[in-house]
């Protein structure tokens, strides 16, 4: 059967200054390839967050994404900004050259309360 | 620079037990899975044993399974492994490495040697 | 197990290919040079292709179903060594080893 991505939160709302957690589940491991978080759809959509690389400025993974049964893609924001609003995506790709784009999850919009 | 540094190889009798230490420097230890990989005189590479970043989760190959303990302190960015029973098949190179995001391996330390001997 | 020839020889500037066959699409596959026994190995490539930013151009490294390939364009002396493939399975969170490519520059 094929992978489903959960992200079993609709919408989620955080005063300015603070962080917040988006969650997102897989249902396999398989088949193999990496999962990235993106804001918005389409051709102008921002990569936030990838679990192949570290970098990622206020971003930080929920659960310890290197047990090798993780099923968890949950990301922290930390220090949450109004440019922050918007909807997220956890999606999952398949290995390739280059990696393809299997399945996302069903979104979640994020609300940035002024403080 | 990321840098590897086993230590803790010894000439023991079967049957012994020996703890292997890899310190880590230059990178994260914390965010980071780890795994001892070891080679025999004159054969390939063998992965022994894995280790989540939390330290939580721990992975063994067969042929240690049940006599080797895989550890790490990440306030001490110090990995570890524990070997009980041991026998003349696990005189080897022994290896620390740091895992990819996908469980394979970017940097290896210089190694460190087993010998098991009567 | 992974399986990849045990040997394979060029001249100065030619191409080497080595593939490794056997991990399952259910693998990522890595390349790791040895250049004297019990020497530290050297990651050239992870992830299928990913190549570490001090590991020089002329290694790359593909994968097409269960089988990956290393190809050396312009294969120099100093890359005589033993090449390991390695992979991961997602299935049964095991690295595996083949046996290793010894290569000798004519």
């Known amino acids: 059967t094929e992978v489903k991505v959960i992200q079993p939160e609709k919408s989620v709302s955080v005063a300015a200054g603070d962080s917040t957690v988006l969650n997102c589940t897989l249902t396999s491991l398989l088949p193999v390839g990496p999962i990235r978080w993106y804001r918005g759809v389409g051709q102008s959509r921002q990569l936030i967050y990838s679990f192949t690389t570290e970098h990622f400025p206020r971003v930080t993974n929920v659960s310890d994404a290197t047990k090798r049964s993780n099923l968890d893609f949950s990301i922290r924001i930390s220090n949450v900004t109004p440019e922050d609003a918007g909807t997220y995506y956890c999606v999952k790709f398949q290995r390739g050259s280059p990696d393809t784009e299997i399945q996302s999850g069903g979104g979640t919009e994020v609300y940035v309360l002024a403080k | 620079d990321v840098q590897l540094v086993e230590s803790g190889g010894a000439v023991v009798r079967p049957g012994e037990t020996l703890r292997l230490s890899c310190t880590a420097s230059g990178f994260t230890f914390s965010s980071y899975a780890m795994s001892w990989v070891r080679q025999a005189p004159g054969k390939g590479l063998e992965w022994v044993s894995g280790?989540?970043?939390?330290?939580?989760?721990?992975y063994y190959a067969d042929s240690v399974k049940g006599r080797s303990t895989i550890s790490r302190d990440n306030s001490k960015n110090t990995l570890y492994l524990r070997m009980s029973s041991l026998t003349a098949e696990d005189t080897a190179v022994y290896y620390c490495a740091r895992e990819t995001w996908n469980h394979l391996f970017d940097y290896w330390g210089l190694g460190t040697l087993v010998t098991v001997s009567s | 197990a992974l399986t990849q020839p045990a040997s394979v020889s060029a001249n100065p500037g030619e191409t080497v290919k080595i593939t490794c066959s056997g991990g399952g699409t259910s693998s990522y596959y890595g390349w790791y040079q040895q250049k004297s026994p019990g020497s530290a190995p050297v990651t050239l490539i992870?992830?299928?292709?990913k190549r570490p930013s001090d590991i020089p151009s002329r290694f790359s490294g593909s994968a097409s179903g269960s089988t990956a390939t290393l190809t050396i364009t312009g294969v120099q002396v100093e890359d005589e060594a033993v090449y390991y493939c390695?992979?991961?399975?997602?299935?049964?969170?095991?690295?595996?080893f083949g046996a290793g490519t010894t290569l000798t520059v004519l």
């Open positions: 992870h992830s299928d292709d």
């Open positions: 390695g992979g991961y399975d997602y299935t049964t969170y095991v690295n595996t």
């Open positions: 280790i989540s970043a939390s330290g939580s989760d721990t």
